[in-house]
């Protein structure tokens, strides 16, 4: 059997670190057998069999010029084997970042904090952390570990499915190469990393007869669970074309009527989403949608009711541990005073 331990990586390759002493091992001889060493394709003897180093070649303070293929020969001139030297660095702790687009799953991505220059793989796992006692800050030995399944196509990402919203998790990402391993532990809670995808299907429509109004409507992001226990709230921004500043409102549901649009000008509108009880952060903005207020005349009859805004049927009870979430259904609301003023202005 070969006296050379096979490091993780392709066969026939041995590894070292720049600036350090490197030992190469002749694979096809018995441990301790004296051998001669040559660079592949070069007749010059690098180290003879009388070196006292047996089957090993020592390179002091290796640098990039030492990389390449080496040949070892036994005393009778037989080929002891060929060895390729590759230089690089041991792993440094990888950088890990986790995010959740919904309240049931989260994903973690990682990146090396230094490129080692060597074949590298990553081991990914997680534990669920549990708190000891209501008042205790101390955490119990956690449950797990379980593997965090990695994306199949080599993307540096793994996904935890079926996570618990109120639990804390410890993610372990270990970078492994032939010179060692290094681990990053990251504590995450779904509440803090939750960032929904932006709302979808944003539409902006004029309101016939109201030259200062636009109705915007949108839907939940497709990634948000279909029957949500946790609802989203929204932030809407709008601005007339060529106007640098956005106006911001927080609609109460899945639509909003803008009542101070600039007559005759197209307006850009975008929406963002966040967990209704402010867990995590706001989503990125949706792609902008455009609309121009109506230039037509007002209808003969002004409706007494209009679905100009939406609001929850139930107010969230922030002090309860698992608060009820509001209904998704819009609720009609009386026109407010501002609307009446606008109607008078239009009629005049």
């Amino acid at each position: 059997s070969s006296p050379c331990p096979q490091a993780w990586g392709p066969p026939g390759v041995q590894y070292g670190q720049p600036g350090r002493s490197v030992k190469l091992c002749c694979p096809g001889v018995t441990a301790g057998d004296p051998v001669s060493w040559f660079r592949d394709g070069e007749p010059k003897l690098l180290q003879g069999p009388d070196s006292g180093l047996g089957h090993e070649l020592v390179l002091a303070q290796a640098d990039s010029t030492d990389e390449g293929t080496y040949i070892c020969q036994t005393l009778d001139g037989a080929l002891g084997g060929t060895v390729t030297l590759q230089l690089g660095y041991p792993p440094a702790r990888p950088v890990v970042s986790c995010q959740a687009a919904d309240y049931e799953n989260f994903s973690c991505t990682w990146s090396p904090s230094q490129i080692s220059g060597l074949p590298t793989r990553y081991l990914t796992s997680y534990r669920k952390k549990t708190v000891l006692g209501a008042d205790s800050q101390r955490r119990s030995p956690s449950t797990g570990p379980w593997p965090c399944p990695q994306d199949p196509l080599g993307a540096a990402r793994c996904v935890v499915h079926g996570a618990e919203f109120w639990s804390q998790y410890r993610i372990n990402v270990t970078e492994v190469n032939p010179l060692g391993a290094s681990t990053r532990l990251l504590d995450v809670s779904l509440q803090s990393i939750l960032r929904p995808d932006p709302p979808q299907g944003l539409r902006v429509e004029s309101v016939p007869g109201y030259p200062r109004r636009l109705r915007a409507s949108w839907t939940y992001p497709a990634s948000w669970p279909c029957q949500p226990h946790f609802l989203l709230k929204f932030r809407l921004q709008y601005r007339p074309a060529q106007h640098p500043a956005w106006s911001t409102v927080e609609p109460a549901g899945l639509e909003e009527v803008i009542t101070d649009a600039v007559a005759g000008l197209p307006h850009a509108v975008r929406v963002s989403a966040r967990d209704f009880l402010d867990a995590g952060t706001w989503s990125t903005w949706s792609p902008e949608a455009w609309g121009t207020p109506s230039t037509g005349t007002i209808p003969k009859e002004i409706p007494a009711w209009g679905q100009l805004h939406t609001q929850p049927e139930v107010e969230p009870q922030v002090d309860s541990p698992a608060p009820p979430r509001p209904s998704l259904q819009p609720h009609p609301r009386l026109l407010d005073h501002r609307d009446s003023v606008e109607q008078v202005a239009v009629l005049a």
């Epitope: 440094a92 230094q114 490129i115 220059g117």
Partner: antibody, heavy 118, light 107 residues
Amino acid sequence: EVQLLESGGGLVQPGGSLRLSCAASGFTFSRYMMGWVRQAPGKGLEWVSSIVPSGGITIYADSVKGRFTISRDNSKNTLYLQMNSLRAEDTAVYYCARDHMGIVATDWGQGTLVTVSS
Amino acid sequence: DIQMTQSPSSLSASVGDRVTITCQASQDITNYLNWYLHKPGKAPKLLIYDASNLQTGVPSRFSGSGSGTDFTFTITSLQPEDFGTYYCQQYDTLHPSFGPGTTVDIK
């Protein structure tokens, strides 16, 4: 020899923007994590932001999150810090730093002064 | 985020004196701790990494020890070029943080 040279500092009004650059030499820039650290007048050192070798993950101090953006151009061996919505408390000397073997900020530039004042 | 505290905040010492600075982390940072010397108008210089390892080229009169939350930095015989502000810094987390600094000046 590792060399880091910051530029782009200067006087800017509150709410304004500035982009700092850090030109790196003496090492293979694309292999290393890089970052920015600042020191306000009469104060201590404060880590600002870091970026992995590929640029794929960026990390920010809470004090600058949403206002500052770190980026890098590995083909130009240059690190950047785009600073928007600047405030008086962002006034500081900004240092570019290199991480090595997982050790944060082993090598530093000489710094560039950013003054935010009306 | 992890808070770092340092003591003393300043000290006066003479050339040849033994100087000790302590640094405490608000939670366990294993040995992910650096010590720097910063002089006005200059770049900070890394002296000690991983709590106790001497950075290449740094004189052996500097040393560091500790793990977990409590760390110590020592200069066995203070030299004229050692005056300045010393900072500890944790890098256990992805959000590194510095101690407030210890200014060492001439007595």
